[in-house]
Amino acid sequence: IFKKEQAMCLEKIQRANELMGFNDSSPGCPGMWDNITCWKPAHVGEMVLVSCPELFRIFNPDQVWETETIGESDFGDSNSLDLSDMGVVSRNCTEDGWSEPFPHYFDACGFDEYESET
């Protein structure tokens, strides 16, 4: 199931790259699967927020990103994820790449990786 989520994530990243005009030489942070959830590509200076993933939910490859990006002038709409929400994890896209998640998954979500045993 987790291999499938990873594959779905890579599909979503590819589509996002096309929509955003990203390529391998583009400045910014590439989309990634971090073994817990899927992060979309971002420009330097952007913060990406994701809600805690449901442990055994299968990604729908056609779904929109369950993330929001906060840039200098884009703070999302009233329905967007917000840093004031519990169960939200953020990463900053810096010139050196993605920052560590804040809060860490374990503190924000109660787990820090998918378990190999069920």
Epitope: M86, G87, P103, F106, G110, S116
Partner: antibody
């Protein structure tokens, strides 16, 4: 009813190793929804979280940076207990040491505590 | 590490009073904030978790509020058994740091 019972010496000499054990009843140290923590309290430092162990298909530990080089927290599944070892102690490690269970519900909180053990570091 | 401060450090009150204790975090912690009560010679006891959720078995006269960096613990109609020391603790990031405590004693 979850209960945590602490045991271990109350006096440790400087440079030696502080060793305490926390026996769990009413729960299992392998509970995938819990963490098992050590906290200490002294007049100078107040309440200080030292670290935790937990099982999520494999055993993991998180330690406070202030003691990371000296601390080991080990689970013992056969006895459903966990232990604290603090090496190279100094008088500044004199404190009341508590074990506690961490539970998740929107955040991690410590909902069951041991009775506390006063450990004095002195020659 | 995230630093936690509390005010006041101590307060004197009478049975039946309504008291408020404040806790401030040195950085943004959303609502990852817990409150504990401790009596002399005893271990701390969880009162409130995630800013405002009352732990099972805790009387409803205890309540918590706040988000971001500023939080409060309120005790309505103080009872004799409430005279104790109260600690806040952040849970957004290990190490989970505690406030220095607020001692509530009888006026």
């Amino acid at each position: 009813q979850v209960q945590l019972q602490q045991s271990g010496p109350g006096l440790v000499k400087p440079s030696q190793t502080l060793s305490l054990t926390c026996a769990i009843s009413g729960d299992s140290v392998s509970n995938r929804l819990a963490t098992w923590n050590w906290i200490r309290q002294s007049p100078s430092r107040g309440l200080e979280w030292l670290g935790r162990t937990y099982y999520r298909g494999k055993w993991k530990n998180h330690y406070a940076v202030s003691v990371k080089s000296r601390i080991t927290i080990n689970p013992d599944t056969s006895k459903s207990q966990f232990s604290l070892q603090l090496n190279s102690v100094t008088p500044e490690d004199t404190a009341v040491y508590y074990c506690a269970r961490g539970t998740w519900n929107q955040d991690w909180f410590l909902d069951h505590w041991g009775q506390g053990t006063l450990v004095t570091v002195s020659s | 590490d995230i630093q936690m401060t509390q005010s006041p450090s101590s307060l004197s009150a009478s049975v039946g009073d309504r008291i408020t204790i404040t806790c401030r975090a040195s950085q943004y912690i959303v609502r990852y904030l817990n409150w504990y009560q401790q009596k002399p010679g005893k271990a701390p006891k969880l009162l409130i978790y995630a800013s405002y959720n009352l732990q099972s078995g805790i009387p409803s006269r205890f309540s918590g509020s706040g988000s971001g960096t500023d939080f409060t613990l309120t005790i309505n109609s103080l009872q004799p058994e409430d005279f104790a020391t109260y600690f806040c603790q952040q849970a957004i990031m290990a190490p989970y740091t505690f406030g220095p405590g607020t001692k509530v004693d009888i006026k």
